[in-house]
């Protein structure tokens, strides 16, 4: 007997071929011995089973010798062993319909869960293996579940459902609902202006919601809310911003925050989240804003930063066109009687410049 | 047991539409066909159609552009409408469950029927 | 369609008489055909289904036979209780189709 594997709503072609290759009297019946269709003279007939409706056959292909059935929207209750009859032989074809399905949602929240069901007849054993796009490897049976969804679990997955050697594949889109980016850093120089992105890692029709940036900074003993905003198809409105420091926010997206000047006492780090509509659960991005500040008292020239820096990072005070330079992996360093010239206060990882900062030292006589 | 009971007007007037419902109890209306069949005094049965939960009803090609069919899950029910009825309407009425299974297809389950009189 | 001819329409039989029914389909049914009793304000019930396979239930005296077009009712012992209009039901093709009915009357 011959097995045919169907996915739920697809169609599906059941070949039945006479040795003649021309038109003769066939029926297709099901397990019930009913008839589903068949041919009456050079008509096509159909009979009282469920399947009726949603079967058919390719009449070009009669004179050849072909008298497959068509099964369009399958339904897991399909699942049976169909009978086609022609030349006094018959040909059994066991036909599997499964269903692969996502429990809630494809829409997820990042850190959710996923669970794929699938559905498949009475007294099929099947496997399924599926595959994320970031190539994550996942096996189950009835149900298969992924605990924490991460960003880069986002798009399209692709299951094979195995049953008596033969496979059915299902293709099934999760988006992740998250930022593009866990965390930020922005570092900026004193009284610079300062501009927050935070871009989404999805795109969706209508994009309703609410949401808050809260913020720590390094020399408060508290957070606080810096700014309350609504967002509704994809417009967003202020309902409420601190005095200081006054943030204005781009009414489109993605969202976009500005600080107008960079201020020490900001320095710190924020989060900012997002409650969607008819979701349960809020899309978080940290964002960290680093303050650079060079000054030149009396004798002294000093270099700091404020908010959340790295051990590993260095802050150096050098002159420019000469080698002199002071270097620490701290957030202060200082010159006492600095040579005139051009300083430069350099905030760098490894290497790499993170933040710059001139200041010119003049001659004292 | 599964019971059918019919109900609906009695008497239409000519041209206008006949109205059926066929009320399910003891069982459920999602896993079967259901039908509608006549009868008209000194003729025999005529099916009329069927109409299953999920797929699009069957009519008898002799009355299909005058009769729809259809089922809410949610009363366990399903009807009839036969518009611009005439005299020839006039029959009993009855909703039967169709059943099929190994060999069989057919009515097992029958309402009692309803009296349909089409006069002005 | 698939028309059903049934005859006769109309007979009359004694108690404990053989009864013969006959029903033509205008085309090949198959044994796509079963035969139902009706009576007096009743539904019909379901009496032989696949031409010859008897339903649960119902009396041994009743029995069916033929393909393709030509199919034959019979009752081999009438009892009083089996005065009714009986009738064949092709189930072959949609539309479901029935014959005219025989009336079994007591003579």
């Known amino acids: 007997k011959k097995v045919v594997l169907g996915k739920k709503g697809d169609t599906v072609e059941l070949t039945c071929n006479a040795s003649q290759k021309k038109n003769t009297q066939f029926h297709w019946k099901n397990s019930n011995q009913i008839k589903i269709l068949g041919i009456q003279g050079l008509f096509l007939t159909k009979g009282p089973s469920k399947l009726s409706d949603r079967a058919d056959s390719r009449k070009s292909l009669w004179d050849q010798g072909c008298f497959s059935m068509i099964i369009k929207n399958l339904k897991i209750e399909d699942s049976d062993t169909y009978i086609c009859e022609v030349e006094n032989k018959k040909e059994e074809v066991e036909l599997l319909v499964f269903g692969l399905t996502a429990n809630s949602d494809t829409h997820l929240l990042e850190g959710q869960s996923l669970t794929l069901t699938l559905e498949s007849p009475p007294g099929s054993s099947p496997s399924v293996k599926c595959r994320s796009p970031g190539g994550k490897n996942i096996q189950g049976g009835r149900t298969i579940s992924v605990p924490q969804l991460e960003r880069q679990d986002s798009g399209t997955w692709t299951c094979t459902v195995s049953q008596d050697q033969k496979t059915v594949e299902f293709k099934i889109d999760i988006v992740v609902l998250a930022f593009q980016k866990a965390s930020s850093t922005v570092y900026k120089k004193e009284g610079e202006q300062v501009e927050f992105s935070f871009p989404l890692a999805f795109t969706l029709e209508k994009l309703t919601g609410s949401g808050e940036l809260w913020w720590q900074a390094e020399r408060a003993s508290s957070s606080k809310s810096w700014i309350t905003f609504d967002l509704k198809n994809k417009e967003v409105s202020v309902k409420r911003v601190t005095q200081d420091p006054k943030l204005q926010m781009g009414k489109k997206l993605p969202l976009h925050l500005t600080l107008p000047q960079a201020l020490p006492q900001y320095a710190g780090s924020g989060n900012l989240t997002l409650a969607l509509e008819a979701k349960t659960g809020k899309l978080h991005q940290e964002v960290n804003l680093v303050v650079m500040r060079a000054t030149q008292f009396q004798e002294n020239l000093t270099c700091e930063v404020w908010g959340p820096t790295s051990p590993k990072l260095t802050l150096s005070l050098k002159l420019e066109n000469k080698g002199a330079t002071v270097s620490k992996q701290a957030k202060a360093v200082w010159v006492l009687n600095p040579e005139a010239g051009m300083w430069q206060c350099l905030l760098s990882d490894s290497g790499q410049v993170l933040l710059e900062s001139n200041i010119k030292v003049v001659p004292t006589w | 047991q599964v019971q059918l009971q019919e109900s609906g007007p009695g008497l239409v007037k000519p041209s206008e539409t006949l109205s059926l419902t066929c009320t399910v109890s003891?069982?459920?209306?999602?896993?079967?066909?259901w039908s509608w069949i006549r009868q008209s005094a000194g003729k025999g049965l005529e099916w009329i159609g069927r109409?299953?939960?999920?797929?699009?009803?069957n009519y008898n090609p002799s009355l299909k552009s005058r009769v729809t069919m259809s089922v809410d899950t949610s009363k366990n029910q399903f009807s009839l409408k036969l518009n611009s009825v005439s005299a020839a309407d006039t029959a009993v009425y009855y909703c039967?469950?169709?059943?099929?299974?190994?060999?069989?297809?057919?009515?097992?389950?029958w309402g009692q029927g309803t009296t349909v009189t089409v006069s002005s | 369609d698939v028309q059903m001819t049934q005859s006769p329409s109309s007979l009359s039989a004694s108690v404990g008489g053989r009864v013969t029914i006959t029903c033509q389909a205008s085309q090949d049914i198959s044994n796509y055909l079963n035969w139902y009793q009706q009576k007096p304000g009743k539904a019909p019930k379901l009496l032989i289904y696949y031409a010859s396979n008897l339903e649960t239930g119902v009396p041994s005296r009743f029995s069916g036979s033929g393909s393709g077009t030509d199919f034959t009712f019979t009752i081999s012992s009438l009892q009083p209780e089996d005065f009714a209009t009986y009738y064949c039901?092709?189930?072959?093709?949609?539309?479901?189709?029935f014959g005219g009915g025989t009336k079994v009357e007591i003579k």
């Open positions: 039967a469950r169709e059943l099929e299974r190994p060999y069989y297809y057919g009515m097992d389950v």
């Open positions: 039901q092709q189930y072959d093709n949609l539309p479901l189709t």
């Open positions: 003891g069982g459920s209306i999602s896993t079967y066909y």
């Open positions: 109409i299953y939960t999920s797929e699009r009803p």
